[in-house]
């Protein structure tokens, strides 16, 4: 077993006075392992959205190649983020608001060719990165779904699903489904096509809605659908509200697998002040479900800091030359290059969290229990069987707080120890690896802690 480090010495029951039947010492002293759940690839880590390939490509050497080829060149960087899938595009031909000139089977030459895309798929597969294609039809136009020609569009989508599944994509995304009439039944049909090809393929639907009832009605008829929405962006960034949103959602969806993001497409900085970015990264990576990020979230990319850049798709800041429009507007600590060299950067935090999320059983598929920790705080435990357990404590407030962890809220299977080791803090200055007394836990403003402790029988 993953969590047992002692040797399995085979001894016989005869040694114990019974009939001869080989059993292990482990069977004698450890409880039976809980059976591992079946996990799909999108359960094992984060998804990374690249809605605008040209903006992601940036300036400089990136401009040497068509965006799809350029993206292939960035795969090693994406591997370093340990993301499990890329959500790309849309990249199909779409003349604004013109159904006849929208072809979901053709790649817009501005992005590259079908050959480039095939090459990207091959390279991504070699690096164990999956590719999800966004097929939102009228992405350049006013209404993403050409509201007046729903049936024509739905047929185009069906044909596109079959075409791109054959081409080797790992899944699809459709956004703005609040603008799609009869969305639930169309999604059910598209889900059938996708899953009919292979259970290993994924359909993601995105909505701008933050209304739980609307979200639940979309999920009702689609059991394996992954839905991104604006649900969490309504939190008002307070601990209590976020806790209630998360627990409400999990209870209402019957603990089915879900995704966590603040919107269907936009950057975290569209919703959060800079001081909360680390806290939200920690939360998104440790809630039960698939975290979904947009390119640039790992560095805190902020369109508002880049004059003239579109809010929904600012240029990716690879290095200081990425935004030549205004010399000096970009400092090293805003860029991938600068943050890669700084162990205390947001990017370094993202990498560490992504690494933990993709390898720890308790974070991969562990149970989740939220419990009271005092006003302004959101805290929860993730645990799986006899594996290492994780405690997350988040201070959304502007003031330092002492945490009053109410262990009495927790079931017996998830009890808290007196001390837990600090795996990481979102703020500098704490000694990682040091044991912290949970009764005396104090958090700085906007600080999040990830603590770990062993299973105790």
């Amino acid at each position: 077993h993953h969590h047992h480090h002692h040797e399995q010495k085979l001894i016989s029951e005869e040694d114990l006075g019974g009939e001869q039947k080989l059993i292990s010492e482990e069977d004698l002293r450890a409880p039976r392992c809980r059976e591992l759940p079946a996990q799909k690839w999108w359960h094992t880590g984060a998804l990374y959205r690249i809605g605008d390939l040209q903006a992601f490509q940036g300036h400089g050497a990136g401009n040497l190649a068509a965006p799809i080829s350029g993206l292939k060149g960035r795969l090693d960087y994406l591997s370093s983020l340990k993301v499990k899938g890329l959500v790309l595009g849309p990249i199909h031909k779409n003349q604004k608001d013109d159904v006849a000139q929208t072809d979901l089977l053709q790649i817009d030459p501005n992005f590259g060719s079908k050959e480039d895309f095939d090459s990207l798929l091959q390279s991504a597969k070699k690096k164990s990165i999956r590719v999800i294609l966004d097929l939102t039809p009228n992405y350049r136009g006013e209404n993403s779904w050409f509201s007046t020609q729903v049936d024509t569009v739905a047929t185009k989508v069906k044909d596109a699903l079959e075409f791109w599944l054959q081409a080797g994509v790992d899944g699809f995304q459709v956004r703005d489904i609040e603008n799609l009439k009869d969305a639930s039944s169309f999604l059910a049909e598209w889900q059938n096509i996708t899953k009919g090809f292979s259970e290993d393929r994924l359909l993601i639907a995105g909505t701008n809605s933050s209304d739980l009832q609307q979200i639940l009605s979309l999920l009702e008829s689609n059991k394996d659908l992954l839905l991104t929405s604006s649900y969490l962006s309504d939190s008002g960034s307070t601990g209590e509200h976020t806790k209630s949103l998360v627990t409400q959602y999990l209870n209402a969806t019957g603990n089915r697998w879900c995704s966590w993001s603040l919107s269907q497409a936009r950057l975290l900085t569209s919703f959060l002040p800079a001081q909360l970015l680390r806290l939200y990264q920690l939360m998104l990576f440790t809630l039960p479900g698939t975290p979904v990020f947009s390119y640039g979230d790992e560095i805190g990319l902020d369109a508002a800091a880049l004059p003239g850049q579109p809010m929904e798709a600012p240029v990716m800041l690879w290095d200081e030359s990425s935004f030549p429009d205004i010399p000096g507007a970009v400092s090293a600590n805003m860029t991938v290059k600068g943050q890669s060299e700084d162990p205390g950067s947001l990017l370094s935090l993202f990498r560490r969290l992504s690494d933990q999320r993709s390898k720890e059983r308790s974070l991969l598929h562990g149970d989740f229990h939220a419990f009271s920790a005092g006003p302004g705080l959101f805290s929860y435990i993730r645990h799986w069987d006899q594996n290492e357990r994780f405690l997350v404590v988040l201070n959304f407030g502007d003031v330092g707080l002492s945490a009053g962890l109410q262990a009495s809220d927790l079931p017996a299977s998830a009890s808290l120890p007196a001390k837990a080791d600090l795996l990481l803090s979102t703020q500098p200055g704490r000694e990682e690896g040091s044991p912290l007394e949970l009764e005396r836990l104090k958090l700085e403003p906007h600080e999040g802690l990830l603590l770990r402790f062993p299973y105790a029988a």
């Epitope: 050497a61 401009n63 960035r74 960087y77 480039d116 890669s340």
Partner: antibody, heavy 126, light 108 residues
């Protein structure tokens, strides 16, 4: 399969210009960049510059700035390198090479040259 | 500009020998280093990219290592067809792209 086929050898007088072509086939021409690299007799390799066949962006080596122009014709999938005001030390074999991008941990893009033309000898002599 | 210095500039070896060529950058280039082989009258051929990744179709006797400023190309067991000139190339700080001056590998 990917091929880059260059124009034939040229002999030029000092002060003249030369235009070398590089016809690409076997891949989507507009999806990659083309670099030009030269090699004087018995010497090493010297990068001259690149052009993006995707958008026409160019970047030239500092020492050649003002004398070199790189262009592409997407209809014929051909790249061109013109060098003006030729001097005797421009005598070299000129290569075109396809530039493929790759990145590392810090997101910086590296460029490798995965396919090369056969080379064009340009001799500058009075 | 980043300078690339190869050593030795030439070496003699026999078939079956293990050979190492080094390349030093004047400043850190992370792992952005490629190796090429060039035979007389022919265009260079890519062997290794990103310091240690083998280009497809290149025999596994070629390997690369290093990062920062110091890099090596190793040929584990020289074959007759390996006698050629080898160049390193950096592309970390581009433009400009710069090559090493070359290492000529001759038959002993």
């Amino acid at each position: 399969q990917v091929q880059l086929v260059q124009s034939g050898a040229e002999v030029k007088k000092p002060g003249a210009s030369v235009k070398v072509s590089c016809k690409a086939s076997g891949y989507t021409f507009t999806s990659y960049g083309i670099s030009w690299v030269r090699q004087a007799p018995g010497q090493g390799l010297e990068w001259m510059g690149w052009i993006s066949a995707y958008n026409g962006n160019t970047n030239y080596a500092q020492k050649l700035q003002g004398r070199v122009t790189m262009t592409t014709d997407t209809s014929t999938t051909t790249a061109y390198m013109e060098l003006r005001s030729l001097r005797s030390d421009d005598t070299a074999v000129y290569y075109c090479a396809r530039g493929e991008l790759y990145s590392g941990y810090d997101g910086t893009l590296g460029i490798l040259f995965d396919y090369w033309g056969q080379g064009t000898l340009v001799t500058v002599s009075s | 500009d980043i300078q690339m210095t190869q050593s030795p500039s030439s070496l003699s070896a026999s078939v079956g020998d293990r050979v190492t060529i080094t390349c030093r950058a004047s400043q850190s280039i992370s792992s952005y280093l490629n190796w090429y082989q060039q035979k007389p009258g022919k265009a260079p051929k890519l062997l290794i990219y990103a310091a240690s990744s083998l280009q497809s179709g290149v025999p596994s006797r070629f390997s690369g290592s290093g990062s920062g400023t110091d890099f090596t190309l190793t040929i584990s067991s020289l074959q007759p067809e390996d006698f050629a000139t080898y160049y390193c190339q950096q592309s970390y700080s581009t433009p400009p792209i710069t090559f090493g001056q070359g290492t000529r590998l001759e038959i002993k």
